[in-house]
């Protein structure tokens, strides 16, 4: 039977909105993989942990990509 | 070869449970869900639900959840399906299935209801 | 939860004929959908997925095609050991099968 689309992704509807980095408590980057033909970003909100999926191809995604690795080799030692 | 085994038939009393069993070999049991199928005699296949052998996560077909329970045991590479309340209308046969490519059924195991 | 309806119900064809089948969902299902042939005694059988693609084995006789949520499928070329029940299955949201279709030779 072919895997259901519900459980291929975890994304069902994909936001191109700028997303704060402060407002940020997570970002997950889940890789593509024979369940899920598509690379998946999953930010969680600090706010009430609200989970959005984010559009990988979007420029404002990228950039805030960059800035939250450029965060986090800032605290690394 | 893939291959899902199950037993041919179940002759259970109405009101009494039944465990229906499905047992995969020729793959890799945890890397593929499986999915189990009704169909009544002369009636189309109904999707009852889904279980992901490698942590045991479950959706259902909401006519079934109060109706089916799915489990697994990865060491003997086994999925079950347990009914409940048994009654006439739960007389069919039972089919697992699973997600892989070349995908593989079970020959199915009739269930018949009677007291 | 989608549904999915499926016609006819049951069909006659000649040998050598060719016969279509549509299935109807109550969404868009992305091209989520596939085809089975059920023989009794027997697990169903994969012919189509994802609309149109063939399942390996199976012959170019068996197409598929549609979108949003309009799906039909085709075989030319009817043989003998086409007769069957026929299954439409969405996958977009879990999983729902359509009524089925009991395909006969004249």
């Known amino acids: 039977v072919p895997l259901s689309r519900t459980v291929r992704c975890t994304c069902i509807s994909i936001s191109n909105q700028p997303v704060n980095p402060r407002s940020l408590e997570k970002l997950e980057i889940i890789p593509a993989s024979q369940f899920c033909p598509r690379v998946e970003i999953i930010a969680t909100m600090k706010k009430k942990g609200e989970k959005r999926c984010l559009n990988p191809e979007s420029k404002a995604i990228k950039n805030l990509l960059k800035a939250v690795s450029k965060e986090r080799s800032k605290r690394s030692p | 070869q893939v291959q899902l085994q199950q037993p041919g038939a179940e002759l259970v009393r109405p009101g009494a449970s039944v465990k229906l069993s499905c047992k995969a070999s020729?793959?890799?049991?945890?890397?593929?869900?499986m999915i189990w199928v009704k169909q009544r005699p002369g009636q189309g296949l109904e999707w009852i639900g889904m279980?992901?052998?490698?942590?045991?996560?479950?959706h259902y077909n909401q006519m079934f959840k109060d109706k089916a329970t799915l489990t697994v045991d990865k060491s003997s590479s086994t999925a079950y399906m347990q009914l409940s309340s048994l009654t006439s209308e739960d007389s069919a046969v039972y089919y697992c299935?699973?997600?892989?490519?070349?995908?593989?059924w079970g020959q199915g195991t009739l269930v018949t209801v009677s007291a | 939860d989608i549904q999915m309806t499926q016609s006819p119900s049951s069909l006659s064809a000649s040998l050598g004929g060719r016969v279509t089948i549509t299935c109807k969902a109550s969404?868009?299902?992305?091209?989520?959908i596939a085809w089975y042939q059920h023989k009794p005694g027997k697990g169903p059988r994969l012919l189509i997925y994802?609309?149109?693609t063939l399942q390996p084995g199976i012959p170019s006789r068996f197409t598929g095609s549609g979108s949003g949520r309009d799906y039909s499928f085709s075989i030319s070329n009817l043989e003998p050991e086409d007769i069957a029940t026929y299954y439409c299955?969405?996958?977009?949201?879990?999983?729902?099968f359509g009524g089925g279709t009991k395909l006969e030779i004249k």
């Open positions: 279980i992901d052998p490698s942590d045991s996560a479950t």
């Open positions: 020729g793959y890799t049991f945890t890397s593929h869900w």
């Open positions: 994802d609309t149109s």
């Open positions: 969404q868009d299902i992305h091209k989520y």
């Open positions: 299955l969405q996958y977009d949201d879990l999983y729902t």
């Open positions: 299935a699973n997600t892989r490519h070349d995908e593989s």
